[in-house]
């Protein structure tokens, strides 16, 4: 099923890409290209019997193109508003600049202490799980070597069950590996929430009447940090997938050689164990530092907030994360409204349905226009 997150990512990546290019040059491509990218998401889904994907696609594309145009229009305005918000906030915090900086510093250290054990655990788990994966797969290679040594009468019939098993075991163990490692990213999210909440409480006395503005800035920080956690999850997942794609051919190679001569088979079985070890070790080396790098990125984001709120803030492109947050909120809201309607539609009569579809079109318009008004 196409998710709100996938749609928002396509839209945001597309928007960022446009922002980096000369706007005018790509103006005429905008609508059709975004539509193409969104339609591509639905490509695999449309063969399915249910009409859910088709209905969603019909309603989503106009909503998305309109939202995209609105984003482009509001980007500069938002940049100004965020700048103004920060100025007011800085002015309010200026008399307490040292205390504010110190509070953020304390919070930063607290965050590091909170996250360090998790990064260590993630590193240890990567190592443990990689070793487990290697231990789980090695016996299949050894069994095949043994069958080959004992030179059973019907080599193909005797080796093939092991090769088939290895094929499945690679997939199953990589799934297991993902299942063991990705929860760390979710754990990080909880720690982010706790840390930002504490920061909010410790800065509240200094913000006074600009509390709303401070909250808005902290929401932006939380969004950025959680986005990092999502990226961590995605990277772990992608690395595990890559491992699967590197291991799968090893099993296929053996299965391919079953049809050939014994020599080729001997060679491929002799190399199998070594290749398994090598690929797993490479995965371990690549993924072990992910936790530490993630921590560094969070610390850096907290440090940026300290600079933003400090007296010597330079020009920061901070509005983009607010814009992205807003986009994601809108798309999520569109999806949940669509899902609600979808479940209601199942129990509605045709005249009610037609009436409801008219209302839906009006609502879509409203949803796009609702680009979060900033507290000013």
């Amino acid at each position: 099923e196409v998710s709100a997150d996938q749609v928002a990512t396509v839209m945001w990546d597309y928007f960022s890409q446009l922002s980096n290019n000369a706007k005018e040059a790509v103006e005429h491509l905008q609508k059709s290209e975004l539509t193409q990218q969104l339609n591509a998401l639905f490509q695999d889904k449309l063969g399915e019997v249910n009409t859910y994907a088709g209905d969603l696609q019909k309603k989503l594309v106009p909503f998305a193109t309109e939202l995209h145009e609105r984003l482009a229009k509001d980007s500069e305005k938002l940049k100004e508003e965020i700048g103004k918000e920060l100025e007011e906030l800085r002015a309010r915090l200026l008399p307490h600049a040292n205390e504010v900086s110190q509070k953020i510093g304390d919070n930063l250290r607290e965050l590091q202490q909170r996250l360090e054990p998790y990064a260590d655990q993630l590193r240890t788990q990567v190592s443990t799980q990689a070793e487990q994966l290697r231990r789980q797969l090695t016996p299949y290679a050894q069994r095949m070597e043994r069958v080959l040594r004992e030179n059973a009468d019907s080599l193909q019939a005797s080796l093939r069950p092991h090769a088939d098993e290895l094929k499945a075991k690679i997939d199953q163990n990589v799934e297991e590996l993902k299942g063991r490692l990705t929860p760390y990213a979710d754990e990080f999210k909880v720690k982010i929430d706790q840390t930002v909440e504490e920061l909010r409480r410790s800065l509240a006395p200094y913000a006074q009447d600009t509390q709303e503005k401070l909250n808005h800035q902290l929401e932006g920080l939380t969004f950025q940090m959680k986005k990092n956690a999502e990226e961590l999850k995605a990277r772990i997942s992608a690395s595990a997938e890559e491992l699967r794609q590197r291991l799968a051919p090893l099993a296929e190679d053996v299965r391919g050689n079953l049809r050939g001569n014994t020599e080729g088979l001997q060679k491929s079985l002799a190399e199998l164990g070594g290749h398994l070890d090598q690929q797993v070790e490479e995965f371990r080396r690549r993924v072990e530092p992910y936790g530490e790098n993630f921590n560094k990125a969070l610390v850096q984001q907290m440090e940026q907030l300290r600079q933003k709120l400090g007296p010597h803030a330079g020009d920061v492109e901070g509005h983009l994360s607010f814009l992205e947050k807003d986009l994601r909120d809108k798309v999520n809201s569109f999806f949940s409204t669509f899902k609600e309607k979808e479940s209601q539609d199942k129990t509605l009569s045709l005249p009610e349905l037609e009436q409801q579809q008219e209302q839906q079109q009006e609502q879509q318009q409203e949803q796009v226009q609702m680009l979060a008004p900033l507290e000013s």
Epitope: A157, P161, D164, E165, K167, A168, D171, Q172
Partner: antibody, heavy 117, light 107 residues
Framework: QVHLQQSGAELVRPGSSVKISCKAS????????MNWVRQRPGQGLEWIGQ????????TYNGKFKGKATLTADKSSNTAYMHLSSLTSEDSAVFFC??????????WGQGTTLTVSS | DIVMTQSHKLMSTSVGDRVSITCKAS??????VAWYQQKPGQSPKLLIY???TRHTGVPDRFTGSGSGTDFTLTIYNVQSEDLADYFC?????????FGSGTKLEIK
């Protein structure tokens, strides 16, 4: 928990064909071999073949080649077995079974096929 | 194909007794043997694999042994709910093959 739900009993004419389904739930369907086993009335079990839903790879027992065709649909977590040119000899209970580490750790409830004119 | 022979079609036993069901492979299959239990009107259930490893949730009254060509499933302290057909299976070589089954009846 793992559950394999098979389609209902079938009564068909000789010469026709039939497609039996097995819907899996409670585990990652695409990364386990799905096997099919035949049990004739009052007799033992015979392995028909297996399919790997992840890529559609199949292994057949030579005895059933040309009789059984195995397919799988990842989007609905369902495995299918198509049996063709049916005769009264094909009357049996057919089971789907998940292969976990070589052996069949979970079985469907069975589908009874009766071929009769 | 490897033939798995279960010479006893029917075995009678009493509650509390010990019973041994045997299975012979037509060629060496190492320890690649499983045992399944099939109660009347039900699908088979895995009991033992790798000749002697009990599947999750199987009572320790069920024990498997053997290697090469001769295998045994022993049920200690037989219970009335053990009334069933028992099948051995080899998975050393394709096609995987089953024994013809042994029916356990409770006297």
């Amino acid at each position: 928990q793992v559950h394999l739900q098979q389609s209902g009993a079938e009564l068909v004419r000789p010469g026709s064909s039939v497609k039996i389904s097995c819907k899996a739930s409670g585990y990652a369907f695409s990364i386990y071999w799905m096997n099919w086993v035949r049990q004739r009335p009052g007799q033992g079990l015979e392995w028909i073949g297996q399919i790997y839903p992840g890529d559609g790879d199949t292994t057949y027992n030579g005895k059933f080649k040309g009789k059984a065709t195995l397919t799988a649909d990842k989007s609905s977590n369902t495995a299918y077995m198509h049996l063709s040119s049916l005769t009264s000899e094909d009357s049996a209970v057919f089971f789907c079974a998940r292969r976990g580490d070589y052996v069949y750790d979970y079985w469907g409830q069975g589908t009874t096929l009766t071929v009769s004119s | 194909d490897i033939v798995m022979t279960q010479s006893h079609k029917l075995m009678s036993t009493s509650v509390g007794d010990r019973v041994s069901i045997t299975c012979k492979a037509s060629q060496d299959v190492g320890t690649a043997v499983a045992w399944y239990q099939q109660k009347p009107g039900q699908s088979p259930k895995l009991l033992i694999y790798w000749a002697s490893t009990r599947h999750t949730g199987v009572p320790d009254r069920f024990t498997g042994s053997g290697s090469g060509t001769d295998f045994t499933l022993t049920i200690y302290n037989v219970q009335s709910e053990d009334l069933a057909d028992y099948f051995c299976q080899q998975y050393s070589t394709y096609p995987f093959t089953f024994g013809s089954g042994t029916k356990l009846e409770i006297k």
